[in-house]
């Protein structure tokens, strides 16, 4: 069998809402993946599991099941959304994200995704990790790749 390539493209959109009393931020982050099937037979994308980390803390998880079938030598672009919550010990972020004096409220999030594919009863998992900028102060739609955090080191925030 030839490879199944998974490429994390980036954040497509981030929609923000707030619980003012709880000083909590809700971010619905939609990500884009390209999955390429280099085989001469179809493969099934069985599930996608994703999680988002902020400052080494998991703030959101999502799982999509029975997603699609990718034909021979074909590629499909798949969007998936991870609902995230920044609260509790990170409530200082509410002060940052709702502070209007700051024009862009970029925070660095680590996006982790695992794609499980199956073909002829065989299962394969491919994982990706990327740091991405997301604006927690407003609803944002990104050009694909625009939100990439290029620093290879783990950021402080």
């Amino acid at each position: 069998p030839r490879s199944i390539d998974v490429k994390y493209i980036g954040v497509k959109s981030a929609y923000v809402s707030y619980d003012v009393q709880k000083r909590t931020i809700y971010l619905n982050i939609t990500n884009t993946l390209n999955i390429t099937n280099n085989n001469y037979y179809s493969v099934e994308v069985e599930n996608i599991t994703a999680q988002v980390q902020f400052s080494k803390t998991v703030i959101g998880k999502a799982r999509l099941n029975n997603i699609t079938i990718i034909g021979p030598l074909d590629m499909k672009q798949i969007d998936y959304t991870v609902p995230t919550v920044i609260a509790e010990e990170m409530s200082y972020m509410y002060d940052f994200c709702t502070l209007i004096s700051i024009k862009v409220h970029n925070i660095v999030l680590m996006m982790q995704v695992t794609v499980t594919t199956t073909y002829f009863g065989h299962s394969e998992q491919i994982s990706q990790e990327r740091y991405q900028y997301v604006d927690c102060g407003r609803n944002t739609t990104y050009q694909l790749g625009q939100s990439e955090y290029l620093n290879v080191l783990q950021p402080q925030q």
């Epitope: 923000v16 809402s17 707030y18 003012v20 000083r23 200082y92 509410y94 002060d95 940052f96 994200c97 709702t98 502070l99 209007i100 004096s101 700051i102 024009k103 102060g137 407003r138």
Partner: antibody, heavy 117, light 112 residues
Framework: EVQLVESGGGLVKPGGSLKLSCAAS????????MSWVRETPEKRLEWVAF????????YYADNVKDRFTISRDNAKNNLYLQMRHLKSEDTAMYYC??????????WGQGTLVTVSV | DIVMTQAAFSNPVTLGTSASISCRSS???????????LFWYLQKPGQSPQLLIY???NLASGVPDRFSSSGSGTDFTLRISRVEAEDVGVYYC?????????FGGGTKLEIK
């Protein structure tokens, strides 16, 4: 316990300079924006200057722009206000305050600046 | 600049009764993110100001629930349900929607 302690105030002649300091403790200073606010002898409160958590955003009230400079040292947990070309109307109690989307959540006890001949 | 307007003095109130303090802004303080950037502070005699209410209607940490606040985009009211002696001081409304942040002139709470 969150504490903000201002220092550096005093009596200065018009045209003179002063540097105010604010020592922060009890919270992660580098996570928060900070502001200086002053209380005039007439008991009016006036916002003076703002600095974001990392120092990337700095703003001033029009009446102090080009005369005052706000800065911070996150390693030392200190906020500063360098005041030059002081005028009599700058006479006030100067407070540092922790700033954010939820307002000035904590204030120092203030340091008095008197500009007079 | 956004102008914040307050009456200099409240109507004198008796301890244990309710009091209301009003504030008006020259522009709506409702942001597109759904938050109204109106704050209330109390400065007690000889003390620094303290935050009472953040984002129009939310009680700051440690503030008794005798205090409440409501309003529209431009007209705001702070209510104290049972006034106590320790509530005496000057109440300031502030807008943090736009720079420069602007304070109202302050309303002094008068006890009968």
């Amino acid at each position: 316990e969150v504490q903000l302690v201002e220092s550096g105030g005093g009596l200065v002649k018009p045209g003179g300079s002063l540097k105010l300091s604010c020592a922060a403790s009890g919270f992660t200073f580098s996570n928060y924006a900070m502001s200086w606010v002053r209380e005039t002898p007439e008991k009016r409160l006036e916002w003076v200057a703002f600095i974001s958590d990392g120092g990337g955003y700095i703003y001033y009230a029009d009446n102090v722009k080009d005369r005052f400079t706000i800065s911070r040292d996150n390693a030392k947990n200190n906020l500063y206000l360098q005041m030059r070309h002081l005028k009599s109307e700058d006479t006030a109690m100067y407070y540092c305050a922790r700033d954010g989307g939820t307002g000035f959540t904590y204030w120092g006890q203030g340091t008095l600046v008197t500009v007079s001949v | 600049d956004i102008v914040m307007t307050q009456a200099a003095f409240s109507n004198p109130v008796t301890l244990g009764t309710s009091a209301s303090i009003s504030c008006r802004s020259s522009k709506s303080l409702l942001h597109s993110n759904g938050i109204t950037y109106l704050f209330w502070y109390l400065q007690k005699p000889g003390q620094s100001p303290q935050l009472l209410i953040y984002q129009m209607s939310n009680l700051a940490s440690g503030v008794p629930d005798r205090f409440s606040s409501s309003g529209s985009g431009t007209d705001f009211t702070l209510r104290i349900s049972r006034v106590e002696a320790e509530d005496v001081g000057v109440y300031y409304c502030v807008q943090n929607l736009e720079l420069p942040y602007t304070f109202g002139g302050g309303t002094k709470l008068e006890i009968k």
